[in-house]
C-alpha cells in the first residue's frame, strides 16, 4: 500500500470488529429454555463473515436416541440440497448437493454438525438440521447471512467537498460525518448482492478544517478523516 504523502490522505483508522467467531452454535442458554419437547423448532438468523469457516449445529440429542439426521440446505437459485445419515445402516446419502465446501464436520455418527469451509456470498441461505427420533422430530434452522467487508475510501474531490465510499459491502454500510455537512448519499447494488454506498458532503462554514467519515458495518466500523484544503483530492483506500 502507498504511504501517505500529503494531508488529504488517510490520517487515522479505528477498527471495531463485531464478529470474531465463525461457529454458528448458539449459546445454549438462549435456546434451551423453551425447547424441551419433541417437535420443537428453533430458527436463528446468523451473520457470518465471508472467507471464514462456519460450523452449524444440530439440537443436543444423543445419537442413541436418533433414527436419521438430515441437513437441508436451501441456497438462492439452487435446488434444495439434503445430506442424510441413517443410524441403523450407518450410511450417508446426498441429494442435489454440489458445493464441496459444505460438508459434515466429521463422520455423522461422531458429530452431526455441518461445516462451511471458506464462506462465500453464494452460501447465503437457509440451513436446517432435522433429527428424527422415535417420538417425533427436532429441528434447528439457520438463516445464514454472509457478510462482506466493504472497502472504504475517503477523498476530497473539489473545494470543501469530500467523498466517502464504502465499496461492495454486504449488507450496505452506513456512512455518517463529523461534523455534519450538506450531504447526499447514493447506493449502488451489484448482482452478487453487495452494495456500494457513496456519501458526498460539502461544508460551507470555513472554520471546519477537519472532517471525519464514520463507516458502520456488521463486520466492523472504520473512521477516516481528512483536512479540507483547497487542492484537488488525492485518494486513499482501506479495508475495514
Amino acid at each position: 500500500a502507498a504511504q501517505p504523502n500529503n494531508s488529504l490522505m488517510l490520517q487515522t483508522s479505528k477498527e471495531n470488529h463485531a464478529l470474531a467467531s465463525s461457529s454458528l452454535c448458539m449459546d445454549e442458554k438462549q435456546i434451551t429454555q423453551n425447547y424441551s419437547k419433541v417437535l420443537a423448532e428453533v430458527n436463528t438468523s446468523w451473520p457470518v463473515k465471508m472467507a471464514t469457516n462456519a460450523v452449524l449445529c444440530c439440537p443436543p440429542i444423543a445419537l442413541r436416541n436418533l433414527i436419521i439426521i438430515t441437513w437441508e440446505i436451501i441456497l438462492r437459485g439452487q435446488p434444495s440440497c439434503t445430506k442424510a445419515y441413517k443410524k441403523e445402516t450407518n450410511e450417508t446419502k446426498e441429494t442435489n448437493c454440489t458445493d464441496e465446501r459444505i460438508t459434515w464436520v466429521s463422520r455423522p455418527d461422531q458429530n452431526s454438525d455441518l461445516q462451511i469451509r471458506t464462506v462465500a456470498i453464494t452460501h447465503d441461505g437457509y440451513y436446517r438440521c432435522i433429527m428424527v427420533t422415535p417420538d417425533g422430530n427436532f429441528h434447528r434452522g439457520y438463516h445464514l447471512q454472509v457478510l462482506v467487508t466493504p472497502e472504504v475510501t475517503l477523498f476530497q474531490n473539489r473545494n470543501r467537498t469530500a467523498v466517502c465510499k464504502a465499496v461492495a459491502g454486504k449488507p450496505a454500510a452506513h456512512i455518517s460525518w463529523i461534523p455534519e455537512g450538506d450531504c447526499a448519499t447514493k447506493q449502488e447494488y451489484w448482482s452478487n448482492g453487495t452494495v456500494t454506498v457513496k456519501s458526498t458532503c460539502h461544508w460551507e462554514v470555513h472554520n471546519v478544517s477537519t472532517v471525519t467519515c464514520h463507516v458502520s458495518h456488521l463486520t466492523g466500523n472504520k473512521s477516516l478523516y481528512i483536512e479540507l484544503l483547497p487542492v484537488p483530492g488525492a485518494k486513499k483506500s482501506a479495508k475495514l
Epitope: C25, E28, R64, E88, P134
Partner: antibody, heavy 119, light 110 residues
C-alpha cells in the same frame, strides 16, 4: 403421567443371578432409552448401561460387561436388568431412569430396588 | 472414560447463605455449543431428581434458587439462598455415549 415402577427387593446368594424389572407407563415405551444405575449403601451413583426399546440396542459399562444383560418386553412395556455371578459388593439399590431426548437428561426415575447379596 | 471430580465432598451451610459445588471433568464435555453436564439432587431413601441440564438450564418445577454454570471442564452448581429442605446429596453427571457421575457432595444445613 410418566411412571417407572420397579420390582421388589431381592436377597440373593453369592454366585446367583438377579433380574430386576422396570415397568413404564404414561408414554410410548419404545420411544425412549432406559438406563440402569446402581448405588451401594452410603456410596454414589454408578451407571451400568442402557437399552433402547425402539431397536433393542444396548450399551454396557465396561465394568459390568459379561455379567449384565438388559432386555425389554414391548407387550408389557417393561425393561429388565439381569446381573449374574453376584458377589457381596453387588449389594445396592438398582434404579432405572428414562432419558429425555433434549440434552440427554434423565427426567424420570424408578423408585429403586434393593438387591442384597449375602451368604 | 471421562472422570468427574466433585468438591467439596461435604458442605455445611446456614439457611439463607449460598452453597457452591464444583465438578471438574477430566476432559471437555462441551461439544457443538452445548455442555453435556447435568446436576441431580438425592435425598435419603429417594431416587435422584434432575435439577439442572446442559450445564445451566433449570429443569421444570425446580426452584430458581438452584443455578448452574460452566463449560468445557469446569462446572458449578449454586444454591442461593439455601433452605432447610436442601439437605441432600448432589451429583454431577456427564451424558455422552458412556455416562459418568461425580462422587457426590453432601450438603447439610446448619
Amino acid at each position: 403421567q410418566v411412571q417407572l415402577v420397579q420390582s421388589g427387593a431381592e436377597v440373593k446368594k453369592p454366585g446367583a443371578s438377579v433380574k430386576v424389572s422396570c415397568k413404564a407407563s404414561g408414554y410410548t415405551f419404545t420411544s425412549y432409552v432406559m438406563h440402569w444405575v446402581r448405588q451401594a449403601p452410603g456410596q454414589g451413583l454408578e451407571w451400568m448401561g442402557y437399552i433402547n426399546p425402539y431397536n433393542d440396542d444396548t450399551n454396557y459399562n465396561e465394568k459390568f460387561k459379561g455379567r449384565v444383560t438388559m432386555t425389554r418386553d414391548t407387550s408389557t412395556s417393561t425393561v429388565y436388568m439381569e446381573l449374574s455371578s453376584l458377589r457381596s459388593e453387588d449389594t445396592a439399590v438398582y434404579y432405572c431412569a428414562r432419558e429425555d431426548y433434549y440434552g440427554s437428561r434423565w427426567g424420570y426415575w424408578g423408585q429403586g430396588t434393593l438387591v442384597t447379596v449375602s451368604s | 472414560d471421562i472422570v468427574l471430580t466433585q468438591s467439596p465432598a461435604s458442605l455445611a451451610v446456614s439457611p439463607g447463605q449460598r452453597a457452591t459445588i464444583t465438578c471438574r471433568a477430566s476432559k471437555s464435555v462441551s461439544t457443538s455449543g452445548y455442555s453435556y453436564m447435568h446436576w441431580y439432587q438425592q435425598k435419603p431413601g429417594q431416587p435422584p431428581k434432575l435439577l439442572i441440564y446442559l450445564a445451566s438450564n433449570l429443569e421444570s418445577g425446580v426452584p430458581a434458587r438452584f443455578s448452574g454454570s460452566g463449560s468445557g471442564t469446569d462446572f458449578t452448581l449454586t444454591i442461593n439462598p439455601v433452605e432447610a429442605n436442601d439437605t441432600a446429596n448432589y451429583y454431577c453427571q456427564h451424558s455422552s455415549e458412556l455416562l459418568t457421575f461425580g462422587q457426590g457432595t453432601k450438603v447439610e444445613i446448619k
